[in-house]
Interface confidence: low
């Protein structure tokens, strides 16, 4: 009898394909799409869950324009290049030798080019603010109770230690989760920002990624929190680069 | 919150069999497995078995011959039954939550119950 | 069945010095697949339950001093307080979880 559980599947990524090949006989889980073997214990990298939801292709999302200096993910799905840490390459092209650069959360932070595009290095995402909109209610949430929910759910549910969580804004029905990671702050094994901000995403748009978990079910002492808009702003340790025509559009 | 408490009689006789139950609250043993591990006074920690969330098991090869872990997934219980005791086995008993779908760490621990082996 | 060596066996430092404990396993504990080490590192006080440190040989549990440190991959495994502080007395265990699991002797940890 070996270590493996009878039920062989990936807690926290359900778009894997898993068998009992792992160490002692344990369950190995490798991603969709990349096969990279990944670590079911954490939340999967963004890059390796894109290219997964590519190799079973859905309708592309529309995503709103971007604010100011941050960046917001106009250009929708596409179909990475990963590393072999399952991080995003620095230059993403696509079929037709369309070449962008991209920060950690493989998101557009240049204007478009052709191969010969140089991305000299992933430009880490530092500062994401989920700007969401609750669905209307009887009364505000009690700012403090809907703070200590939310940072719950991001210790609990992605495993994002406490201290990157780094505040919870709210007017009503406007909430606003500020999530800052430097370089020099995470350290081995911390879950990264911009694989707990996806993960959020998709649990609020009800598309969980956990394998069989029921959906994100949010409740501030008792009562629902139902968004019904999610924005989601990235801020790079180094400005993007756009021409002045992007900019003033 | 995540619990796990230890459970059953202190004193057992030599030759007997020992039966402790560890009652879990805050999650499934649906999702996650418990281990059983001891600790004679004075030593080391020692691993016992393993009830895997899947509902097999697994146990150390030098006491597979009498251990059996089962489970009630309804009580949100897992059971130790260790069997042709003696004064060896006198430890402390504890049980423990996988924090990992393959079982590579142990977060949550109970606060163990000591169990004399005495005639 | 995999063996999992400590040394020292205990270990006095001063308060403020480094203290480094090391695990030898008797097999290397390294998933090629996942790149990951199936090693942890637990600390024990009298009367207490084992709590968990590192896990995946480096990784830091929540909540658990930046003064520890996990290193260390395939057979050979160190765990390192930075600067020993007086709660830091106690016995720390390494454990593989690569075949089943197995617990190290443990070191016990003491103030000079």
């Known amino acids: 009898h070996t270590a493996a559980q009878d039920n062989c599947t990936c807690p926290t990524n359900k778009m894997t394909v898993c068998s009992p090949d792992g160490p002692g006989g344990r369950c190995q889980c490798r991603a969709l799409g990349s096969g990279m073997a990944v670590d079911c214990s954490t939340l999967t990298s963004k890059c390796l869950l894109l290219k997964a939801r590519m190799s079973a292709p859905k309708n592309a999302r529309t995503l709103v324009r971007p604010s100011e200096h941050a960046l917001v993910d106009n250009d929708g799905l596409y179909d990475p290049d990963c590393d072999p840490e399952g991080r995003f390459k620095a230059r993403q092209c696509n079929q037709t030798s369309v070449c962008w650069c991209v920060n950690s959360v493989g998101v557009r932070r240049t204007d478009k080019g052709d191969l010969s595009l140089r991305c000299d290095e992933l430009v880490r995402t530092h500062h994401i603010l989920i700007d969401l909109r609750h669905r209307p209610t009887a009364g505000a949430f009690n700012h403090s109770d809907l703070d200590a929910e939310l940072r719950r759910l991001f210790r609990e549910r992605y495993r994002l230690h406490p201290k990157f969580v780094a505040a919870v804004h709210y007017e009503q029905p406007t909430i606003q989760i500020e999530l800052r990671q430097n370089t020099s702050q995470k350290a081995a094994g911390d879950v990264d920002i911009g694989d707990a901000a996806y993960y959020f995403e998709r649990d609020i748009k009800g598309e969980s990624l956990f394998q069989g978990r029921g959906g994100l079910d949010l409740r501030v002492r008792g009562e629902p929190l139902q968004v019904e808009r999610t924005l989601i702003y990235y801020l790079d340790e180094i400005p993007p680069k756009f021409s002045m025509k992007r900019l003033t559009a | 919150q995540v619990q796990l408490q230890e459970s059953g009689p202190g004193l057992v006789k030599p030759s007997e069999t020992l039966s402790l139950t560890c009652t879990v609250s805050?999650?499934?043993?649906?999702?996650?497995?418990v281990n059983w591990i001891r600790q004679p006074p004075g030593k080391g920690l020692e691993w016992i078995g393993v009830?895997?969330?899947?509902?097999?098991?697994n146990y150390n090869s030098a006491l597979m011959s009498r251990v059996t872990i089962s489970v009630d997934t309804s009580k949100n219980q897992v059971s130790l039954k260790l069997s042709s005791v003696t004064a060896a086995d006198t430890a402390v008993y504890y049980c423990?939550?996988?924090?990992?779908?393959?079982?590579?760490?142990?977060?949550?621990w109970g606060q163990g119950t000591l169990v004399t082996v005495s005639s | 069945d995999i063996v999992m060596t400590q040394s020292p066996d205990s270990l006095a430092v001063s308060l403020g010095e480094r203290a480094t404990i090391n695990c030898k396993s008797s097999?290397?504990?390294?998933?090629?697949?996942?790149?990951?080490?199936?090693l942890a590192w637990y600390q024990q006080k009298p009367g207490q339950p084992p709590k968990l440190l590192i896990y995946?040989?480096?990784s830091r549990e929540s909540g658990v001093p930046d003064r520890f440190s996990g290193s260390g991959s395939g057979t050979d495994f160190t765990l390192t307080i930075s600067s020993l502080q007086a709660e830091d007395v106690a016995v720390y265990y390494c454990?593989?979880?690569?075949?089943?699991?197995?617990f190290g002797g443990g070191t016990k940890v003491e103030i000079k």
């Open positions: 423990a939550r996988d924090e990992n779908w393959d079982g590579a760490w142990f977060a949550y």
């Open positions: 805050g999650f499934s043993l649906t999702s996650y497995g």
């Open positions: 009830m895997w969330a899947g509902g097999s098991t």
């Open positions: 097999q290397s504990l390294l998933n090629s697949g996942t790149r990951k080490n199936y």
């Open positions: 995946w040989a480096s």
């Open positions: 454990k593989q979880s690569y075949n089943l699991f197995t």
